[in-house]
Interface confidence: low
Amino acid sequence: RNLPVATPDPGMFPCLHHSQNLLRAVSNMLQKARQTLEFYPCTSEEIDHEDITKDKTSTVEACLPLELTKNESCLNSRETSFITNGSCLASRKTSFMMALCLSSIYEDLKMYQVEFKTMNAKLLMDPKRQIFLDQNMLAVIDELMQALNFNSETVPQKSSLEEPDFYKTKIKLCILLHAFRIRAVTIDRVMSYLNAS
């Protein structure tokens, strides 16, 4: 096995770039929400911590072994072209665990994207026009999903017939942003590790 070189793998580098952008965008959005929603409990101490991906994806479980196992040969290596053909891992031999980890990240992003888009549709109806989701953050989620490019059906945006409760929507926005920031940190750590290994 050759010694690692400093230049990043061109296959993985786009994902590292996007994950860094994602972390920056969600952190900025969370800061904006905290400032704008001053009278809403929006700090990590005040909110209820809720993980919308709980029991639906297994990002932490799937991605943790990648960090624990520095030697990739310890992982169950095999060709996994059936899982991804995106620019992040374009035509490279990847471990089964790595592919599982990245597909789980993709599913996380997809779930948050649906939630955020649904929430933004409600916030746009608010006569106060107090806060909206940063289009840059939504674009960055989209870019990372495209870079991962898993063969996955698109999830339709949830439509809500009842009149939105704007107070609860803004609270839910804070809860989602806090949870998504934690997930973005995990994603960034995974991409940094994969880029360095």
């Epitope: 009278f39 209820d48 609860k168 609270i171």
Partner: nanobody, 114 residues
Framework: EVQLVESRGGLVQPGGSLRLSCAAS????????MYWVRQAPGKGLEWVAT???????AYADFVKGRFTISRDDAKNTLYLQMNSLKPEDTAQYYC????????RGQGTQVTVSS
């Protein structure tokens, strides 16, 4: 165990006033944000007002200028002074420790009618 007990509400004429109080126990009241939420017949739970630790307050647009939320940390008591009451203020009012009203008292009925 968190306990929130609201005072009795009542029947008030339009334009009238009413003061609700809420006795809190089982948690550190002085370091908690507190809320009043309400539920009108056939409607969902609606946020009314928030009071932060230290006393600064925020109100829903529909009660702004008419309702005042206050607290007495020494007595572990939350208050809601309701003035210029309207028929549409008729609802079950709850004192709550969380914004969504999950940690709330039994509620007290306020009816505004002539």
């Amino acid at each position: 165990e968190v306990q929130l007990v609201e005072s009795r509400g009542g029947l008030v004429q339009p334009g009238g006033s009413l003061r609700l109080s809420c006795a809190a126990s089982g948690f550190t009241f002085s370091s908690s944000w507190m809320y009043w939420v309400r539920q009108a017949p056939g409607k969902g739970l609606e946020w009314v007002a928030t009071i932060k630790t230290g006393g600064s307050a925020a109100y829903a647009d529909f009660v702004k200028g008419r309702f005042t939320i206050s607290r007495d940390d020494a007595k572990n008591t939350l208050y809601l002074q309701m003035n210029s009451l309207k028929p549409e203020d008729t609802a079950q009012y709850y004192c709550a420790r969380d914004y969504a009203g999950r940690l709330r008292g039994q509620g007290t009925q306020v009816t505004v009618s002539s």
